[in-house]
């Protein structure tokens, strides 16, 4: 039960006090008691419940005609059952007794009022009056947890605006309101109560730039909503009529959880006594609601695809045809960024990551815009963000970044359980160097901090700085599977490729050519690849780098070897010993449900079929997956990327609610 104020009574004159329903009010009967009195009794109106405890240990007894010893160990508390119809209509009489004196009476006139700030603390999508049944001042995780949720209003419901909805002080329309969380103030008081009392709604100064609260005028259009709290206003005096009244507020978050903001926002209503104009207002009662800002959540390859993004660039029509066919098979919407908008930047995966935010009443896709800011810089803001599609970015917007800040270096695993710890939304994966040095690359700290602060997909740092481009999607992917954990981890594997090529040579296919049919590309015989000592050494190094990640992933995702599929792939070390795919990197694939768009490797053709394609199909088709090999050689591969790098996917949010997990 909420804590009320302390009321001191004195026999000299009647005391007038306010008691808020649902609160426990302490009654100080000792400090002003007549000197020679040794005991007391209490009588109260029917609407008042008095509890007397003589402790310790506290033995509680409701009032009757009993007398109690007058000593500091006696605790008297009041609660009220109903709101008052008029000021002071509930009475408490304390009678003091002494051995030689007649009883001395002290009178307390109580006004019972109902003041309650309600939000969806039960996470049902509806605001139900709680009236102190639950403590709204704490926010707890898990299926039995409680606490309200706020969305960052980061979409753009007004198509004529260039800004996010949370960047203005206005409510555009009912669409805009739906992105906000409802909070209701319920009051029931005597008619004249607010002539001597005031309600103030407030937020801590440290949180005022993270939230905006609009007050709605009931029965009027949403455009009548006016801002009452926000970055410029930490508090607001409310004009509340006496009697029974409900006031609606709409709350939007302005910031995502981050290193300097744990994501919790407390809104408080304070009841002030303003009856004495000579004195400052006194706090009579406070009620608070704690909201947690919904985290930005990534979706793994195992989630159903809903929309595919790719770029139109010079001469990639065939690539786009293949992606279009794949999207149609997977029943996905397709969005193509035209040449004039991408400014010859084809790396859609690197520019953005599409996740979502969720409250019980609303789910919103949100694009996380990377700070790489090349030709596609404007695409997430201008073409992705919009009505019911949010936007967030982090990191320096001008310089100070590395290739590891592109979002090909940002992936998420499917849900996993690791040594008994559940990650029902999976774990974020990003690449890093294995140790810091003058020239090592790492994901910008601002990005790392943001990802960690979301709390629900605890990040795992992998080692990717050994690659020229340096992205985790160059050596790993996840595909859905009907058995085991519901997915397989795919890892690029030079060892598997050498094994395959050796088998082919043993069967007399040493003369078969890699890169056959590619104009202007020097073809390589299987036997020459196998006999090239330098290439072997390079791939031995690469294998060690991937194996390091393999063990890390097994440990951090709780995987067994049988959860991993090795995809044959060779690499070559280039300048500064950085690795690049030797032939199109098959693990860098587009996963659309059971439909996979895999870079066509142009491997040695044996008995009319590419042996690399055949091997990959034999590994993936038993899982019910359909492999489509896409020619990306000249448009993507030679520019240091593949199919996954050149595409992006919006996926269906998890059915699991993030607030039901325990981070």
């Amino acid at each position: 039960m909420a804590q009320g104020t302390l009321i001191r009574v004195t026999p000299e004159q009647p005391t007038h006090a306010v008691c808020v329903l649902g609160t426990l009010t302490q009654l100080d009967i000792c400090s002003s008691a007549p000197e020679d009195c040794t005991s007391f009794s209490i009588n109260a109106s029917p609407g008042v419940v008095v509890d007397i405890a003589h402790g310790p240990p506290a033995k509680k007894k409701s009032t009757g005609s009993s007398t109690w010893p007058l000593d500091p160990g006696v605790e008297v508390t009041l609660t009220m059952k109903v709101a008052s119809g008029s000021t002071g209509d509930q009475k408490v009489q304390i009678s003091y007794y002494g051995p030689k004196t007649p009883p001395v009476k002290a009178l307390l006139y109580l006004t019972g009022v109902e003041i309650s700030l309600c939000a969806d603390i039960t996470r049902t999508g509806k605001v139900k009056p709680t009236r102190a049944v639950k403590d709204q001042r704490t926010w707890t995780w898990g299926p039995c947890g409680q606490g309200a949720i706020l969305l960052v209003n980061c979409d753009r419901d007004n198509l004529e605006s260039s800004a996010m909805d949370c960047e203005d002080d206005e409510v555009l329309d009912s669409e805009d309101l739906q992105d906000m969380s409802l909070m209701t103030l319920s009051t029931k008081t005597p008619k004249d109560f607010f002539t001597n009392h005031t309600l103030v709604l407030h937020v801590a100064r440290s949180e005022m730039d993270k939230v905006r609260v609009f007050q709605a005028t009931r029965g009027k259009l949403s455009s009548k909503c006016s801002v009452v709290l926000g970055p410029k206003w930490p508090s607001h005096y409310l004009m509340v009529p006496g009697g029974k009244h409900n006031m609606d507020f709409y709350v939007e978050a302005l910031a995502f959880p981050d290193t300097d903001f744990p994501g919790l926002i407390t809104l408080t209503i304070s009841l002030l006594d303003t009856s004495n104009l000579e004195l400052p207002e006194a706090v009579v009662f406070q009620d608070s609601v704690v909201f947690r800002v919904a985290p930005w959540i990534m979706t793994p390859n195992t989630q159903p695809p809903q929309e595919v993004y790719a770029c139109s660039i010079f001469e990639n029509e065939d690539f786009l045809k293949s992606v279009t066919t794949l999207a149609m098979k997977a029943k996905c919407k397709l969005t193509i960024c035209p040449e004039e908008e991408n400014m010859d930047d084809q790396w859609m995966q690197d520019e953005m990551e599409i996740g979502y935010i969720q409250a019980p009443h609303k789910t919103l896709p949100v694009v996380f815009d990377s700070p790489r800011n090349r030709g596609l810089k404007e695409f997430p803001i201008k073409r992705v963000m919009g009505p019911d599609f949010g936007y967030v970015t982090r990191g320096p917007q001008t310089g100070g970044i590395s290739g590891l800040d592109s979002f090909g270096n940002l992936e998420v695993s499917p849900p996993v359980t690791v040594r008994g710890k559940e990650y029902p939304l999976g774990r974020i994966l990003f690449g890093d160097s294995c140790y810091p040095s003058n020239d090592s690359r790492q994901m910008h700290q601002a990005l790392q901090d943001f990802l960690s602060a979301q709390q629900v997909q605890a990040p795992v740092k992998l080692y990717s700085d050994w690659l020229s481009v340096g992205h985790v999607d160059e050596f790993l992917s996840f595909v859905p599977a009907p058995d085991r954990k519901g997915f397989r981890l795919l890892l690029a594997s030079p060892r598997s490729c050498y094994k395959l090529f050796q088998e082919q040579q043993n069967e007399g296919h040493g003369e078969a050519l890699l890169f056959e049919g590619i104009k202007k590309k020097k073809q390589q015989k299987i036997k020459n690849i196998l006999s090239n000592k330098t290439l072997r050494e390079h791939n031995s190094f690469v294998e060690r780098c991937i194996d390091w990640n393999r063990e890390l992933l097994k440990r951090e995702l709780g995987l067994a070897e049988s959860d991993i599929i090795d995809i044959p792939q060779l690499f070559k070390l280039k300048e500064f010993s950085k690795a690049e795919a030797f032939f199109p990197n098959m693990v860098n694939m587009l996963v659309l449900g059971k439909h996979l768009g895999i870079p066509k490797p142009f491997g040695p053709v044996i008995n009319g079929r590419c042996c690399l394609e055949e091997k990959v199909c034999s590994l993936l088709e038993p899982l019910g997956l359909q492999c489509t090999f896409i020619n990306d050689f000249f448009t993507y591969h030679i520019r240091h990327g593949e199919v996954h790098c050149g595409t992006n996917v919006r996926r269906k949010p998890f059915s699991f609610k993030w607030w039901n997990m325990v981070p």
Epitope: L573, K574, E575
Partner: antibody
Framework: QVQLVESGGGLVKPGGSLRLSCAAS????????VSWIRQAPGKGLEWVSF????????YYADSVRGRFTISRDNAKNSVYLQMNSLRAEDTAVYYC?????????????????????WGRGTLVTVSS | QSALTQPRSVSGSPGQSVTISCTGT?????????VSWYQQHPGKAPKLIIY???ERPSGVPDRFSGSKSGNTASLTISGLQAEDEADYYC???????????FGGGTKLTVL
């Protein structure tokens, strides 16, 4: 074969900044590794910085790390060297140089470590 | 002081051969085959004449040859000609924190 032209040099006070540009013609610079090399008056060559063709990693000499930033804009066919907190010892002719990354060998032979195309250089003088 | 050591000057008569040495350490010349040589005439930009220890770019006469033994690389110019008079610089990839090192340069005088 690509041709390179440097610009942006000039006289600057110690602590000041300059931005050098290296513009390419005759070929697409996105196919090339690019390095900046400098030569102080009457002295030898000193390697300064490198950026790979994919624009995914950079390297710097100890003497300039933290003060200089190399970047590229493949759409503009240019590479840049942003020089901050300049010192008198940074006075030199700055050369832009490149090596083609379009390698067909089974294993690339390390073209980022040598420079087969050079610009004519631009003089940077740091003096009060 | 340069990281790779070259003689300050060498000389030779037309038609003769000269060799310029470039001494490094195990983490640079000793470890890598990425040693290159540049020719620079006064007031001009350097020109690549040898890369990967011994390879010659197209257009460079075969009078120029490169080799390496241990931590020392060498440039040999046979059949010296007057136009060979120039400064010569060696360069190597290195495992040090500066990944490309140059020698201090050698002035070749054709007598």
């Amino acid at each position: 074969q690509v041709q390179l032209v440097e610009s942006g040099g000039g006289l600057v006070k110690p602590g000041g900044s300059l931005r050098l540009s290296c513009a390419a013609s005759g070929s697409t610079l996105s196919d090339y590794f690019v390095s900046w090399i400098r030569q102080a008056p009457g002295k030898g060559l000193e390697w300064v910085s490198f950026i790979n063709s994919a624009n995914t990693f950079t390297y710097y000499a100890d003497s300039v790390r933290g003060r200089f930033t190399i970047s590229r804009d493949n759409a503009k066919n240019s590479v840049y060297l942003q020089m901050n907190s300049l010192r008198a010892e940074d006075t030199a002719v700055y050369y832009c140089s490149s090596a083609n990354d379009d390698v067909d060998d089974i294993v690339a032979p390390g073209r980022g470590y040598y420079m087969d195309v050079w610009g004519r250089g631009t003089l940077v003088t740091v003096s009060s | 002081q340069s990281a790779l050591t070259q003689p300050r000057s060498v000389s030779g008569s037309p038609g003769q051969s000269v060799t310029i040495s470039c001494t490094g350490t195990r983490p640079d010349v000793g470890r890598y085959n990425q040693v290159s040589w540049y020719q620079q005439h006064p007031g001009k930009a350097p020109k690549l004449i040898i890369y990967n220890v011994y390879e010659r770019p197209s257009g460079v006469p075969d009078r120029f040859s490169g080799s390496k033994s241990g931590n020392t690389a060498s440039l040999t110019i046979s059949g010296l000609q007057a136009e060979d008079e120039a400064d010569y610089y060696c360069s190597s990839h290195s495992r040090s924190s500066t990944p490309v090192l140059f020698g201090g340069g050698t002035k070749l005088t054709v007598l």
